[in-house]
């Protein structure tokens, strides 16, 4: 069976990385496992990552925004960023607002990677299904 | 042969959904059928599904944004929004502007579904080839 | 073998076509070559192409920013722009900002087939690996 | 800069017909409605049909189907319409105004014309 | 057709006080996206100019002391502080279907 992995918002998200809805709704996971924010890779190989981050707010004060895909593995000490967006001076002072951030590549993930998304201000992140999602396939 | 649709922008079409380009160009069509304004998947599995759209106009009014990829089915009574861009306070007033939403995802769809995308307001759209587009491919 | 490459931002770029890092970190390139800022196909068929490039500035005078991806074939006369993204009027006035441009479609390249990304102000590109990069894979 | 230029004044005769003219210019022409508004004298705005200059597709108010036409030429910019077997009734400032096509707004105005009728 | 009612007809306002226009509509206007409601300022002699369009937003070039709001059918125009040059008259208009309907129309005048 085709691995792959559709994920979409979970508004109910505290802390970093993001958390998904895996489950209800258009959600995909065939393949991949999901835990504790991340997908679990488990067949070494060539995948399509991607992810869109809606963010959003009343009052536009320009805080500058990141939209990280990251990778870890416990062979590694640290988090590999694999794709990134930032934002800054994105909206005029005080008015309501609202952008989106794109992320999408291949990369050649190994068995027992595990794929995060990060965001700098999680206050701002709206969760609606069709606006803020993560997933992936095996080519 | 493989399932896959590259669609681009269809300058004279008033209406909504957008129309587009299934002819000339660097358009693509196989093993999707075109319907006014429609990709009609005709074997079900899995899909990338993926849209850009430019946006641009004279003198910035912050006009609130938004590009969907929705998907109809006879079975089912209403659309589902399988993707979506909103932007708000995006450029300086007053001032030309333009911007980009791209959308793109892997969706698990049925055959008969018609999938079509969305503006929300056509007279800000540009059409050129390479600049607003439409398409998909099974995986 | 699977035809793929990613390739990242290399900052010694200094003309157009803009230049890319083949080698290393998370660069990928597998039955595809890299000659001189370009992906050489050199198998007929279908690609997913994509590419993303992160601009950004101590002090914004909304400089207008184009990004394309673009085709050239010497059996051609003229580049074909395959993908490209626009942005005008995007920041405040004398701010620090930053912005990226994505885009991915699919299209039917031919054996030889030469694809390149420019942009219209290289001094506004950050060539970091995980924000500006250009890839595509065969269907 | 978006500009609406209307034709002048027009005095005519009851059961006759008029022809008003709209030349817009500081925009692309054949992306967004033009939209034509009636104003009778110490009235509100009523709104008569839009055209699309894109493809010549049109709607109508069901109060002016039969009374008024849109046409456009989109060599030169001009939106027209024209007004048939007119009445002292007819008789208002008539307006074009640019329309964005989803939002249905009128963010660009003509002057007006005013219309006449009486014999 | 949608009937926009406008009420007051007529209000006069002191300088740097508020103006406060409202405009019922007899279904509501509203998406899960959008209230499409625009507010448009007449005076004698000159055409409509557009001033908050999607009932909320301020058109380019138009003072930050006009402001929109509402949702469904009911709607509010508030012009704060008044000026001398606010004297107009204000229509309320919908685009939620065909055909486009205004409201009647508030009179404006400075105390």
């Known amino acids: 069976l085709r691995k792959v992995a559709h994920l979409t918002g979970k508004s109910n998200s505290r802390s970093m990385p993001l958390e998904w809805e895996d489950t209800y709704g258009i959600v995909l996971l065939s393949g991949v496992k999901y835990k504790k924010g991340g997908l679990v890779i488990n067949e070494t190989g060539l995948y399509f990552v991607y992810s869109k981050v809606y963010f959003r707010g009343q009052s536009c004060n320009n805080l500058p925004l990141s939209h990280k895909v990251y990778m870890r593995n416990s062979k590694y000490p640290q988090d590999l960023v694999m794709m990134e967006g930032k934002m800054m001076s994105y909206c005029t002072t005080g008015q309501m607002w609202a952008r989106s951030s794109y992320l999408g590549a291949v990369f050649n993930l190994t068995s027992a990677d595990h794929l995060y998304v990060n965001v700098s201000e999680l206050s701002l992140v709206n969760f609606e299904e069709s606006q803020t999602f993560f997933g992936l396939y095996k080519l | 042969l493989r399932k896959v649709a590259h669609l681009t922008g269809k300058s004279n079409s008033r209406s909504m959904p957008l129309e587009w380009e299934d002819t000339y160009g660097i358009v693509l069509l196989s093993g999707v059928k075109y319907k006014k304004g429609g990709l009609v998947i005709n074997e079900t599995g899995l899909y990338f599904v993926y849209s850009k759209v430019y946006f641009r106009g004279q003198s910035c009014n912050n006009l609130p944004l938004s590009h969907k990829v929705y998907m109809r089915n006879s079975k089912y009574p209403q659309d589902l929004v399988m993707m979506e861009g909103k932007m708000m306070s995006y450029c300086t007033t007053g001032q030309m502007w333009a911007r980009s939403s791209y959308l793109g995802a892997v969706f698990n769809l049925t055959s008969a579904d018609h999938l079509y995308v969305n503006v929300s307001e056509l007279s800000l759209v540009n059409f050129e080839e390479s600049q607003t587009f439409f398409g998909l491919y099974k995986l | 073998l699977r035809k793929v490459a990613h390739l990242t931002g290399k900052s010694n770029s200094r003309s157009m076509p803009l230049e890319w890092e083949d080698t290393y970190g998370i660069v990928l390139l597998s039955g595809v070559k890299y000659k001189k800022g370009g992906l050489v196909i050199n198998e007929t068929g279908l690609y997913f192409v994509y590419s993303k490039v992160y601009f950004r500035g101590q002090s914004c005078n909304n400089l207008p920013l184009s990004h394309k991806v673009y085709m050239r074939n010497s059996k051609y006369p003229q580049d074909l722009v395959m993908m490209e993204g626009k942005m005008m009027s995007y920041c405040t006035t004398g701010q620090m900002w930053a912005r990226s441009s994505y885009l991915g479609a699919v299209f039917n390249l031919t054996s030889a087939d030469h694809l390149y990304v420019n942009v219209s102000e290289l001094s506004l590109v950050n060539f970091e690996e995980s924000q500006t990069f250009f890839g595509l894979y065969k269907l | 800069e978006v500009q609406l230029q209307q034709s002048g004044v027009e005095l005519v005769k009851p059961g006759a017909s008029v022809k008003l003219s709209c030349k817009a210019s500081g925009y692309t022409f054949t992306r967004f409605d033009i939209s034509w508004v009636r104003q009778r004298p110490e009235q509100g705005l009523e709104w008569i049909g839009w055209i699309f200059p894109g493809d010549g597709s049109s709607q109508y108010n069901e109060n002016f189907k039969g009374k008024a036409t849109l046409t456009t030429d989109k060599s030169s910019g001009t939106a027209y319409m024209q007004l048939n077997r007119l009445t002292s009734e007819d008789s208002a400032v008539y307006f074009c105004?640019?329309?964005?096509?989803?939002?249905?707004?009128?963010?660009?105005w003509g002057q007006g014309t005013t219309l006449t009728v009486s014999s | 057709d949608i009937v926009m009612t406008q009420s007051p007809a007529s209000l006069a306002v002191s300088l740097g006080q508020r103006a406060t226009i409202s405009c019922r509509a007899s279904?509501?206007?509203?998406?899960?996206?959008?209230?499409?409601i625009h507010w448009y300022q007449q005076k004698p002699g000159q055409p409509p100019k557009l001033l908050i369009f999607l009932a909320s937003h301020l058109e380019s070039g138009v003072p930050a002391r006009f402001s929109g709001s509402g949702s469904g059918t009911d709607f509010t125009l508030n012009i704060h502080p008044v000026e001398e040059e606010d004297a107009a008259t204000y229509y309320c208009q919908h685009s939620r279907e065909l055909p486009r309907t205004f409201g009647g129309g508030t009179k404006l005048e400075i105390k």
């Open positions: 279904k509501s206007v509203s998406t899960s996206d959008f209230s499409y």
């Open positions: 105004a640019r329309s964005l096509i989803s939002t249905a707004m009128f963010d660009h």
